[in-house]
Each structure stands twice: as structure tokens, then as C-alpha cells.
Interface confidence: low
Amino acid sequence: EEELQVIQPEKSVSVAAGDSATLNCTVSSLIPVGPIQWFRGAGPGRELIYNLKEGHFPRVTPVSDPTKRNNMDFSIRISNITPADAGTYYCVKFRKGSPDVELKSGAGTELSVRAKPSAPVVSGPAVRATAEHTVSFTCESHGFSPRDITLKWFKNGNELSDVQTNVDPAGKSVSYSIRSTARVVLTRRDVHSQVICEVAHVTLQGDPLRGTANLSEAIRVPPFLEVTQQSMRADNQVNVTCQVTKFYPQRLQLTWLENGNVSRTEMASALPENKDGTYNWTSWLLVNVSAHRDDVKLTCQVEHDGQPAVNKSFSVKVSAHPKEQGSNTAAENTGTNERNIY
């Protein structure tokens, strides 16, 4: 009597995640009577995948009708393949019994799964930084297989080199993750800049996935302050201007102080954007010199994006010549400055 053969013709099968995998198996004889079962892995820890005799297996269907007369084809189709399905599958013939007795196993078919990486997610620093500082951006993508993958960073189209990339796990796995960190030196012109993380993988057919982050979320451009006095008017009123320029983000509060006392507080809103993405703002304060007996110290105080306040001060000298015209002079561009106006 010829020995029963269990034939698995393919040594390996490669399938894209989401597709169906067909695992072929035929037997050479209907004798002895008994069921076929499919397992993933070998030995005592093997996992039952399908039992043509009985059971509930939602994603597995037989290719041929197992009740068909003279059926010797016990191939199965596994639907909606995921990386977790990778492994070696064995078609095993059992002899009918109580319980069934394992008779013969096929040589096994290795199922490998090609899984696309998830869309790269780029995250930037938790707090903003100013120009000349280095900030780190992180890019993550998960769930891909096989392990080979390429990740590149770009800033405004130019590839970045200060990059550290890791693919995990290091050993064999059903799927992998990649994490990469890029260090970027900020400049004042980076409000409109963008970093791109580009991931290339065999499953993407040459069309890489991209994740982006705007440097506008990471940068703070502190303002320049310039305080100038416009000409004194005939009614003894001095018009003092505080120009706040080239700042980002827009979140800014300006306070005028007269002799240390708050005169007016304003919040920047709906400002027009400069070409480089920064903002400018001008505030005016009208001071009635004749209402003061002593010198008037005017301070323009700016709080930008929650940072410590920056001050610019002017001293308006109340003298015997209050109507003398002042010049359009600006305070020096330092943190706190005073200028006497006669």
C-alpha cells in the first residue's frame, strides 16, 4: 500500500497586508479517513489555524468544498492578511479516531507579509525656541514589513544631515517601527519654513509617504522695539510712538507707563503679516506736557509670547520752554533706555 503523501507545493508565499493568502495543500489518497487541519508553527506550541472537520475560523475558508466527493484538495484562503499572520503554515493529515491521531504533515509554507508603513507623524519641540538655537523634530512610522526602510529629512527641500534613526525591533518580527530625530538650527527667516520626513518602503511602489511640520510651531522671533517722539504739538501735547517690529508669533501685549504707572494696555490682534511671516505693530501715546510739573518718564513695555517684558523708556523734561519742538529721535535699541526731551 502506497504511503499517504501530504503535498504543500510552495515553500514560501509573500502577500501584501490587506490581501488574501492562498495556502495550497493536497493529499495523495482519501485513505485513511480523517480530517486535515492547518497549523501555524510546529511542535507543542503550534497554533490551530483551520480545521476542515469543525470549528469557527472567521478569516479562513477552504478553496474547495470539503464535502465534495473525492475531494483531495485541502487548500485554504486566509483573508485580510496582517503582519501578525506571518509564519510557517503546516497542512496536517489526521486519522479519524477518538481523538484523531496525527498521521502526516506537509513540508510547510512560509507566509511573509508585506505591510505598508503608517503615515509618518512628525512632532516638534514642546516649547518655542529663538533663532540660532537648535530644535529637534521626531518622525515616527509603524507597522511595516519587511524591515528594510529608508527615511530622509528635508528643510525647505534641502536634505538634513543631523539625523539619528532607529528601526525596532532589531530582531525578527512580524512588523517594525521607525523613529528618527532631526536637529534643526533656527533662523529668524524660518517662520514660513517646513520640515518634511519622507519614508520609502518596498510596499509603496516608489511613492514615498511624507509627514510635515511647520517651523512656525517651533520658533519664536522676539520683537525689535523702537520708541520715537513725534514733534510737539501747539497744544503742548507730545506724541510718542512705540514701534514693535519683526516678531512671531502674534501673541503680544504692549503697556504704556507714565512715571511707572500704567497708562494703557493693548493686545495685538489681526495684524498684517510681513513677507517673512513676522508681524509689526505701532502704538502711540499722547502726553500732555503742560499737565505735569515734573519730568515725565514714558515706558513702552512689551510682553511677547509669555516671555519676560522688554522695556524702552523716554524721559520728557518739563522745562521753561515747553513748546520747543522736539526732534524725531529714537531711543537706542537696548532693553531699557531713557531719553530726555526738552
Epitope: 480523517g34 472537520k53 470549528g55 469557527h56 472567521p58 478569516r59 475558508t61 470539503p66 484523531d100
Partner: antibody
Amino acid sequence: RSVEESGGRLVTPGTPLTLTCTVSGFSLSSHGISWVRQAPGKGLEYIGTIGTGVITYFASWAKGRFTGSKTSTTVDLKITSPTTEDTATYFCARGSAWNDPFDPWGPGTLVTVSS
Amino acid sequence: ALVMTQTPASVSAAVGGTVTTKCQASQSVYGNNDLAWYQHKPGQPPKLLIYLASTLATGVPSRFSGSGSGTQFTLTITGVQSDDAATYYCLGGGDDEADNVFGGGTEVVVK
């Protein structure tokens, strides 16, 4: 492919009764046989499935009240100690549910339990 | 244990109309799709209509359709015919192999 029940009759309470499902056109090594009953004026009620080899299972309410066995072409359902509540038409059907649904069904056999 | 709640208990429809019966499982059925629909007429055995929630059984007219997943399932008869007068049962399967439970049934009366 067909299944047919037999063995239904009038029995007194406590008298064991065996119903037989005879199959043709398919092999009992490939499919389980499920038993369903319908009491007069009531809905369908799943009893259990007699599978291949020693694989036999019953709904929780039916455990201890029924047993199952099979040969190459027949499946038996034994009502171990019938009560009047077991009066019903008993159906057998090929299949064990899910992707092996109950199909085809036999015409049914009537069991009456009365003293 | 799984409980299958079927609504309505009875529904009347005119020839050519549409009938819908719903089945709600007390927990997700096995594989989210272990749900079959059966047609039962007096004096006859039940007949399989739909299995795996939405797969039409061989020889069943396409006016019957099934939908749903998890715990909510629907059988729809579009273009009802007089021959469709029957009681319709859902059968849900739980994670345990013996946990197969019929709904209470929906009687369809065709006017």
C-alpha cells in the same frame, strides 16, 4: 445532500428517547450535525451540535438533558429524561453555525411527552 | 451567554413593499459576523437565507439581503412577494462553540 430525522413519538415523562438523523450526500467527518427544536407555538431553540470524533457540545440549558452519538451516516440525539417541556418538533441540520450554517434541514420529527 | 433580541415580533407588508427585521446581540457575535437568517413556514423545515451576516445562501432570491456587524443586524426583504409570508429567525453565535442562540422570530404577514 439531505438529512432526515426519525424516532419521534409519544413518551411518558422520564422515559429516555433517542432521535436519529440520517444523512446522505455528504460525510459526517466533514460536518457537524446540529439539533434544533420548536415547541408548539414557540420559536426555534438551539440544542447542540454533534461533531466529528468526540466533539459534541450542547447549549448550557441542554447539558445533562441530552446526549449525542454518531455512526458514519447517522447522528443520534438522546433525551435522557424527558419532561412535558420537551414536547416539540425536533429538527436536525447539517452544519455547526458561523461559516458552516445550518443547511439543509430535515423535515422534523414530533416528540410528545405526556403522562 | 448570548441573548438575541429580535424586533418586531410581527410585521405586515403589501406585495411589492419592503420589510425589515432587526436582531440585536447582547454582546458581539463571533468574528463580528456569526449571524444567520432563516425562513420558517408552518409544516416545513427552516430554510437558510443569509449567513455570515450578509452572504446570500445558494438559491435564495436577491430580494433578501442581510447587513450589520458586531451586535446589530438587519434582514431586509425588498419587493415582498406573497410566498415570503413566514416567520424569520436570526441565529447568532457567541465565542463559545455551543453558544448559538435564535432570536424570538418575526412573523411577516403579506397583504
